[in-house]
Protein backbone atom coordinates (compact mmCIF):
# COMPACT_ATOMS: atom_id res chain seq x y z
CA UNK A 1 0.00 0.00 0.00
CA UNK A 2 1.19 3.50 -0.88
CA UNK A 3 0.70 5.85 2.08
CA UNK A 4 1.35 9.03 0.05
CA UNK A 5 -2.26 10.29 0.06
CA UNK A 6 -3.03 9.81 3.77
CA UNK A 7 -4.33 12.66 5.90
CA UNK A 8 -1.15 12.97 7.97
CA UNK A 9 -2.56 15.65 10.29
CA UNK A 10 -5.44 13.37 11.31
CA UNK A 11 -3.06 10.45 11.86
CA UNK A 12 -0.77 12.65 13.96
CA UNK A 13 -3.75 13.77 16.07
CA UNK A 14 -4.84 10.17 16.69
CA UNK A 15 -1.28 9.20 17.62
CA UNK A 16 -0.80 12.07 20.06
CA UNK A 17 -4.25 11.69 21.61
CA UNK A 18 -4.36 7.94 22.15
CA UNK A 19 -1.94 5.59 20.33
CA UNK A 20 1.15 7.05 22.01
CA UNK A 21 -0.36 6.45 25.46
CA UNK A 22 -1.02 2.78 24.64
CA UNK A 23 2.52 2.29 23.34
CA UNK A 24 3.95 3.87 26.51
CA UNK A 25 1.68 1.69 28.68
CA UNK A 26 2.94 -1.40 26.85
CA UNK A 27 6.53 -0.30 27.53
CA UNK A 28 5.92 0.48 31.22
CA UNK A 29 8.70 -0.83 33.42
CA UNK A 30 11.37 -0.45 30.75
CA UNK A 31 13.72 2.48 30.24
CA UNK A 32 14.08 4.26 26.89
CA UNK A 33 17.80 3.43 27.02
CA UNK A 34 17.14 -0.33 27.25
CA UNK A 35 16.92 -0.70 23.46
CA UNK A 36 18.78 0.82 20.53
CA UNK A 37 16.70 2.18 17.67
CA UNK A 38 17.76 0.28 14.57
CA UNK A 39 14.76 1.05 12.33
CA UNK A 40 14.39 4.50 10.79
CA UNK A 41 12.29 6.28 8.17
CA UNK A 42 12.92 9.22 5.87
CA UNK A 43 9.49 10.75 5.16
CA UNK A 44 5.87 10.45 6.25
CA UNK A 45 4.73 7.70 3.82
CA UNK A 46 7.94 5.75 4.52
CA UNK A 47 7.37 6.08 8.28
CA UNK A 48 3.82 4.72 7.94
CA UNK A 49 5.09 1.82 5.79
CA UNK A 50 7.61 0.90 8.52
CA UNK A 51 5.02 1.39 11.29
CA UNK A 52 2.55 -0.89 9.48
CA UNK A 53 5.21 -3.55 8.93
CA UNK A 54 6.46 -3.55 12.51
CA UNK A 55 2.94 -3.46 13.99
CA UNK A 56 1.18 -6.08 11.89
CA UNK A 57 3.78 -8.43 10.43
CA UNK A 58 4.50 -11.22 12.93
CA UNK A 59 8.18 -12.01 13.50
CA UNK A 60 9.48 -15.35 14.81
CA UNK A 61 10.24 -13.92 18.27
CA UNK A 62 7.24 -11.56 18.53
CA UNK A 63 4.04 -12.79 16.93
CA UNK A 64 1.40 -11.14 19.09
CA UNK A 65 1.53 -7.35 18.59
CA UNK A 66 -1.41 -7.12 16.18
CA UNK A 67 -3.88 -7.90 18.99
CA UNK A 68 -2.61 -5.14 21.29
CA UNK A 69 -4.72 -2.03 21.83
CA UNK A 70 -2.17 0.28 20.17
CA UNK A 71 -2.19 -2.00 17.10
CA UNK A 72 -5.98 -2.00 16.84
CA UNK A 73 -5.95 1.79 17.08
CA UNK A 74 -3.18 2.05 14.49
CA UNK A 75 -5.20 -0.13 12.13
CA UNK A 76 -8.31 2.01 12.64
CA UNK A 77 -6.33 5.22 12.07
CA UNK A 78 -4.83 3.99 8.81
CA UNK A 79 -8.21 2.64 7.64
CA UNK A 80 -9.90 5.97 8.33
CA UNK A 81 -7.35 8.45 7.03
CA UNK A 82 -5.58 6.61 4.19
CA UNK A 83 -7.75 6.38 1.05
CA UNK A 84 -8.40 2.79 0.03
CA UNK A 85 -6.38 1.27 2.90
CA UNK A 86 -9.41 -0.47 4.43
CA UNK A 87 -9.97 -2.41 1.20
CA UNK A 88 -6.45 -3.85 1.39
CA UNK A 89 -7.25 -5.13 4.89
CA UNK A 90 -10.35 -7.20 4.06
CA UNK A 91 -8.42 -10.36 3.15
CA UNK A 92 -5.62 -9.57 5.62
CA UNK A 93 -8.12 -9.50 8.51
CA UNK A 94 -9.49 -12.91 7.56
CA UNK A 95 -5.96 -14.34 7.39
CA UNK A 96 -5.06 -12.84 10.77
CA UNK A 97 -8.05 -14.50 12.44
CA UNK A 98 -6.70 -17.87 11.33
CA UNK A 99 -3.25 -17.33 12.83
CA UNK A 100 -4.33 -15.91 16.19
CA UNK A 101 -1.63 -16.56 18.76
CA UNK A 102 -1.41 -16.56 22.55
CA UNK A 103 -0.54 -13.09 23.91
CA UNK A 104 2.95 -13.07 25.46
CA UNK A 105 4.98 -9.93 26.16
CA UNK A 106 8.52 -11.04 25.40
CA UNK A 107 11.66 -8.94 25.54
CA UNK A 108 11.73 -9.10 21.75
CA UNK A 109 8.21 -7.59 21.64
CA UNK A 110 9.28 -4.80 23.99
CA UNK A 111 12.20 -4.11 21.67
CA UNK A 112 9.85 -4.02 18.67
CA UNK A 113 7.49 -1.59 20.41
CA UNK A 114 10.49 0.57 21.34
CA UNK A 115 11.30 0.70 17.61
CA UNK A 116 7.68 1.64 16.91
CA UNK A 117 7.82 4.55 19.34
CA UNK A 118 10.92 5.77 17.51
CA UNK A 119 9.21 5.51 14.12
CA UNK A 120 6.14 7.39 15.36
CA UNK A 121 8.34 10.15 16.82
CA UNK A 122 10.15 10.35 13.50
CA UNK A 123 6.77 10.57 11.72
CA UNK A 124 5.79 13.53 13.95
CA UNK A 125 9.14 15.24 13.36
CA UNK A 126 8.88 14.93 9.56
CA UNK A 127 5.37 16.38 9.84
CA UNK A 128 6.64 19.38 11.83
CA UNK A 129 9.42 19.98 9.29
CA UNK A 130 6.87 20.11 6.45
CA UNK A 131 4.84 22.72 8.35
Amino acid sequence: YDFTNCDFQKIEADYLRTISKDLITYMSGTKSTDFNNTVSCSNRPHCLTEIQSLTFNPTPRCASLAKEMFARKTKATLALWCPGYSETQINATQAMKKRRKRKVTTNKCLEQVSQLLGLWRRFIRTLLKKQ
Partner: antibody, heavy 120, light 107 residues
Framework: QVQLVQSGPEVKKPGSSVKVSCKAS????????MHWVRQRPGQDLEWMGT????????DYNQNFKGRATITADKSTSTAYMELSSLRSEDTAVYYC?????????????WGQGTLVTVSS | EIVLTQSPGTLSLSPGERATLSCRAS??????VHWYQQKPGEAPRLLIY???QSISGIPDRFSGSGSGTDFTLTISRLESEDFAVYYC?????????FGRGTKVEIK
Protein backbone atom coordinates in the same frame (compact mmCIF):
# COMPACT_ATOMS: atom_id res chain seq x y z
CA GLN B 1 -28.09 -9.89 17.51
CA VAL B 2 -26.89 -6.43 16.48
CA GLN B 3 -29.40 -3.67 17.14
CA LEU B 4 -29.30 0.10 16.73
CA VAL B 5 -32.33 1.71 18.33
CA GLN B 6 -32.90 5.40 17.68
CA SER B 7 -34.90 7.96 19.64
CA GLY B 8 -38.41 8.95 18.57
CA PRO B 9 -39.64 11.58 16.10
CA GLU B 10 -39.07 15.26 16.84
CA VAL B 11 -40.85 18.45 15.77
CA LYS B 12 -38.64 21.55 16.06
CA LYS B 13 -38.86 25.26 15.39
CA PRO B 14 -36.46 26.95 12.93
CA GLY B 15 -33.31 28.15 14.70
CA SER B 16 -33.53 25.54 17.46
CA SER B 17 -31.46 22.36 17.96
CA VAL B 18 -32.25 18.66 17.97
CA LYS B 19 -30.33 15.79 19.57
CA VAL B 20 -30.97 12.28 18.24
CA SER B 21 -29.72 9.21 20.10
CA CYS B 22 -28.74 5.76 18.85
CA LYS B 23 -28.46 2.94 21.41
CA ALA B 24 -26.27 0.05 20.26
CA SER B 25 -26.41 -3.55 21.48
CA UNK B 26 -25.23 -7.00 20.42
CA UNK B 27 -21.62 -6.04 19.61
CA UNK B 28 -18.50 -4.40 21.06
CA UNK B 29 -19.26 -0.69 20.77
CA UNK B 30 -15.63 0.46 20.47
CA UNK B 31 -14.89 -1.87 17.53
CA UNK B 32 -17.13 0.22 15.31
CA UNK B 33 -17.50 3.82 14.19
CA MET B 34 -20.98 5.29 14.31
CA HIS B 35 -21.97 7.17 11.16
CA TRP B 36 -24.94 9.46 10.69
CA VAL B 37 -26.74 9.66 7.36
CA ARG B 38 -29.79 11.73 6.55
CA GLN B 39 -32.49 11.42 3.92
CA ARG B 40 -34.73 14.35 3.07
CA PRO B 41 -38.25 13.54 1.84
CA GLY B 42 -38.03 11.87 -1.58
CA GLN B 43 -34.27 12.52 -1.71
CA ASP B 44 -31.10 10.44 -1.68
CA LEU B 45 -28.80 9.58 1.22
CA GLU B 46 -26.39 12.18 2.59
CA TRP B 47 -23.46 11.30 4.88
CA MET B 48 -23.23 13.76 7.79
CA GLY B 49 -20.29 12.53 9.81
CA THR B 50 -18.96 9.90 12.15
CA UNK B 51 -17.68 9.31 15.67
CA UNK B 52 -14.99 6.69 16.30
CA UNK B 53 -15.16 5.54 19.95
CA UNK B 54 -11.91 3.55 19.70
CA UNK B 55 -9.99 6.73 18.85
CA UNK B 56 -12.26 9.28 20.55
CA UNK B 57 -12.40 11.28 17.35
CA UNK B 58 -14.95 12.46 14.82
CA ASP B 59 -15.11 13.63 11.23
CA TYR B 60 -17.78 15.67 9.48
CA ASN B 61 -19.14 16.43 6.06
CA GLN B 62 -18.18 20.07 5.41
CA ASN B 63 -21.86 20.78 4.63
CA PHE B 64 -22.64 20.23 8.33
CA LYS B 65 -19.42 21.45 9.95
CA GLY B 66 -20.17 23.83 12.78
CA ARG B 67 -23.85 22.77 12.92
CA ALA B 68 -23.55 19.03 13.58
CA THR B 69 -21.91 17.53 16.66
CA ILE B 70 -21.50 13.76 16.90
CA THR B 71 -20.59 12.24 20.26
CA ALA B 72 -20.89 8.94 22.10
CA ASP B 73 -21.21 7.65 25.65
CA LYS B 74 -19.14 4.46 25.75
CA SER B 75 -20.55 3.46 29.15
CA THR B 76 -24.05 3.14 27.70
CA SER B 77 -23.05 2.27 24.09
CA THR B 78 -25.05 5.23 22.85
CA ALA B 79 -24.17 7.63 20.04
CA TYR B 80 -25.64 11.10 19.64
CA MET B 81 -26.03 13.53 16.77
CA GLU B 82 -26.93 17.12 17.56
CA LEU B 83 -27.88 19.51 14.77
CA SER B 84 -28.19 23.21 15.58
CA SER B 85 -29.58 26.29 13.79
CA LEU B 86 -32.28 24.16 12.24
CA ARG B 87 -34.01 25.27 9.05
CA SER B 88 -36.91 23.80 7.10
CA GLU B 89 -34.46 22.03 4.74
CA ASP B 90 -33.27 19.95 7.71
CA THR B 91 -36.61 18.13 7.75
CA ALA B 92 -35.44 14.57 7.12
CA VAL B 93 -35.08 11.05 8.45
CA TYR B 94 -31.78 10.74 10.31
CA TYR B 95 -30.11 7.31 10.45
CA CYS B 96 -27.24 6.00 12.52
CA UNK B 97 -25.16 3.19 11.02
CA UNK B 98 -22.21 1.28 12.45
CA UNK B 99 -19.00 0.62 10.52
CA UNK B 100 -16.12 -1.63 11.60
CA UNK B 101 -12.84 0.24 12.04
CA UNK B 102 -10.52 -2.75 12.46
CA UNK B 103 -12.43 -5.15 10.18
CA UNK B 104 -15.35 -5.21 7.69
CA UNK B 105 -15.11 -1.39 7.12
CA UNK B 106 -18.68 -1.00 5.87
CA UNK B 107 -22.02 0.27 7.20
CA UNK B 108 -23.50 -3.17 7.84
CA UNK B 109 -26.21 -2.31 10.40
CA TRP B 110 -28.55 0.69 10.51
CA GLY B 111 -30.94 2.22 13.01
CA GLN B 112 -34.63 2.44 12.16
CA GLY B 113 -34.35 6.17 11.49
CA THR B 114 -35.62 9.26 13.33
CA LEU B 115 -37.90 11.72 11.57
CA VAL B 116 -37.06 15.32 12.43
CA THR B 117 -39.59 17.88 11.22
CA VAL B 118 -38.61 21.56 11.24
CA SER B 119 -41.63 23.80 11.02
CA SER B 120 -42.74 27.15 12.39
CA GLU C 1 -15.44 15.14 -2.87
CA ILE C 2 -16.01 11.97 -4.87
CA VAL C 3 -19.22 12.06 -6.92
CA LEU C 4 -21.02 8.80 -7.67
CA THR C 5 -23.32 8.79 -10.71
CA GLN C 6 -25.89 6.02 -10.88
CA SER C 7 -27.68 4.94 -14.02
CA PRO C 8 -30.34 4.48 -15.06
CA GLY C 9 -32.47 6.58 -12.69
CA THR C 10 -35.34 4.11 -13.09
CA LEU C 11 -35.35 0.55 -14.38
CA SER C 12 -38.71 -0.97 -15.38
CA LEU C 13 -38.52 -4.77 -15.43
CA SER C 14 -40.65 -7.85 -14.90
CA PRO C 15 -40.11 -10.54 -12.25
CA GLY C 16 -37.63 -13.15 -13.51
CA GLU C 17 -35.70 -10.64 -15.61
CA ARG C 18 -32.07 -9.63 -15.07
CA ALA C 19 -31.31 -6.16 -13.65
CA THR C 20 -28.02 -4.39 -14.30
CA LEU C 21 -27.36 -1.22 -12.28
CA SER C 22 -24.38 1.04 -12.88
CA CYS C 23 -22.38 3.32 -10.58
CA ARG C 24 -19.60 5.56 -11.90
CA ALA C 25 -17.13 7.41 -9.67
CA SER C 26 -15.66 10.83 -10.50
CA UNK C 27 -12.18 9.51 -9.67
CA UNK C 28 -10.37 6.23 -9.10
CA UNK C 29 -11.64 4.56 -5.91
CA UNK C 30 -10.15 1.08 -6.34
CA UNK C 31 -12.88 -1.33 -5.12
CA UNK C 32 -14.18 0.77 -2.20
CA VAL C 33 -17.82 0.71 -3.31
CA HIS C 34 -20.78 -0.78 -1.42
CA TRP C 35 -24.37 -1.40 -2.53
CA TYR C 36 -27.53 -0.91 -0.46
CA GLN C 37 -31.19 -1.68 -1.02
CA GLN C 38 -33.88 0.59 0.40
CA LYS C 39 -37.61 0.01 0.50
CA PRO C 40 -40.17 2.74 1.36
CA GLY C 41 -40.21 3.55 5.08
CA GLU C 42 -37.21 1.34 5.81
CA ALA C 43 -33.51 1.90 6.49
CA PRO C 44 -31.00 0.95 3.80
CA ARG C 45 -29.79 -2.67 3.85
CA LEU C 46 -26.25 -3.68 2.85
CA LEU C 47 -26.14 -6.06 -0.14
CA ILE C 48 -22.55 -6.06 -1.45
CA TYR C 49 -19.37 -4.56 0.01
CA UNK C 50 -16.03 -3.68 -1.57
CA UNK C 51 -17.47 -4.02 -5.08
CA UNK C 52 -18.00 -7.78 -5.08
CA GLN C 53 -17.92 -9.19 -1.54
CA SER C 54 -21.13 -11.00 -0.64
CA ILE C 55 -22.98 -10.66 2.66
CA SER C 56 -24.32 -13.65 4.57
CA GLY C 57 -28.11 -13.70 4.48
CA ILE C 58 -28.29 -11.86 1.15
CA PRO C 59 -29.61 -14.06 -1.71
CA ASP C 60 -26.93 -15.08 -4.20
CA ARG C 61 -28.90 -13.59 -7.08
CA PHE C 62 -27.25 -10.29 -6.01
CA SER C 63 -23.70 -9.85 -7.26
CA GLY C 64 -21.31 -6.96 -7.75
CA SER C 65 -18.35 -6.25 -9.99
CA GLY C 66 -16.03 -3.48 -11.08
CA SER C 67 -13.02 -1.50 -9.92
CA GLY C 68 -11.44 1.89 -10.49
CA THR C 69 -14.34 4.09 -11.56
CA ASP C 70 -16.99 1.72 -12.98
CA PHE C 71 -19.11 -0.58 -10.82
CA THR C 72 -22.09 -2.81 -11.47
CA LEU C 73 -24.75 -4.45 -9.31
CA THR C 74 -26.50 -7.36 -10.99
CA ILE C 75 -29.71 -9.05 -9.87
CA SER C 76 -29.77 -12.28 -11.90
CA ARG C 77 -33.51 -13.02 -11.64
CA LEU C 78 -35.79 -10.39 -10.12
CA GLU C 79 -38.11 -11.52 -7.36
CA SER C 80 -41.12 -9.47 -6.22
CA GLU C 81 -39.28 -8.35 -3.06
CA ASP C 82 -36.38 -6.91 -5.12
CA PHE C 83 -38.38 -3.94 -6.41
CA ALA C 84 -36.81 -1.08 -4.44
CA VAL C 85 -34.25 1.73 -4.67
CA TYR C 86 -30.56 0.77 -4.86
CA TYR C 87 -27.72 3.05 -3.76
CA CYS C 88 -23.99 2.79 -4.24
CA UNK C 89 -21.67 4.36 -1.63
CA UNK C 90 -17.93 4.96 -1.53
CA UNK C 91 -15.70 4.61 1.52
CA UNK C 92 -12.45 5.33 -0.32
CA UNK C 93 -12.05 8.70 1.37
CA UNK C 94 -13.94 11.25 3.46
CA UNK C 95 -16.48 12.67 2.98
CA UNK C 96 -18.26 9.41 2.24
CA UNK C 97 -20.75 9.85 -0.58
CA PHE C 98 -23.76 8.03 -2.03
CA GLY C 99 -25.09 7.85 -5.54
CA ARG C 100 -28.55 9.28 -6.24
CA GLY C 101 -30.07 5.82 -6.48
CA THR C 102 -31.65 3.59 -9.11
CA LYS C 103 -35.31 2.71 -8.68
CA VAL C 104 -36.14 -0.80 -9.87
CA GLU C 105 -39.88 -0.87 -10.56
CA ILE C 106 -42.33 -3.46 -11.87
CA LYS C 107 -43.00 -3.12 -15.60
Amino acid sequence: QVQLVQSGPEVKKPGSSVKVSCKASGYIFTDYAMHWVRQRPGQDLEWMGTFIPLLDTSDYNQNFKGRATITADKSTSTAYMELSSLRSEDTAVYYCARMGVTHSYVMDAWGQGTLVTVSS
Amino acid sequence: EIVLTQSPGTLSLSPGERATLSCRASQHISRSVHWYQQKPGEAPRLLIYFASQSISGIPDRFSGSGSGTDFTLTISRLESEDFAVYYCQQSYSFPYTFGRGTKVEIK
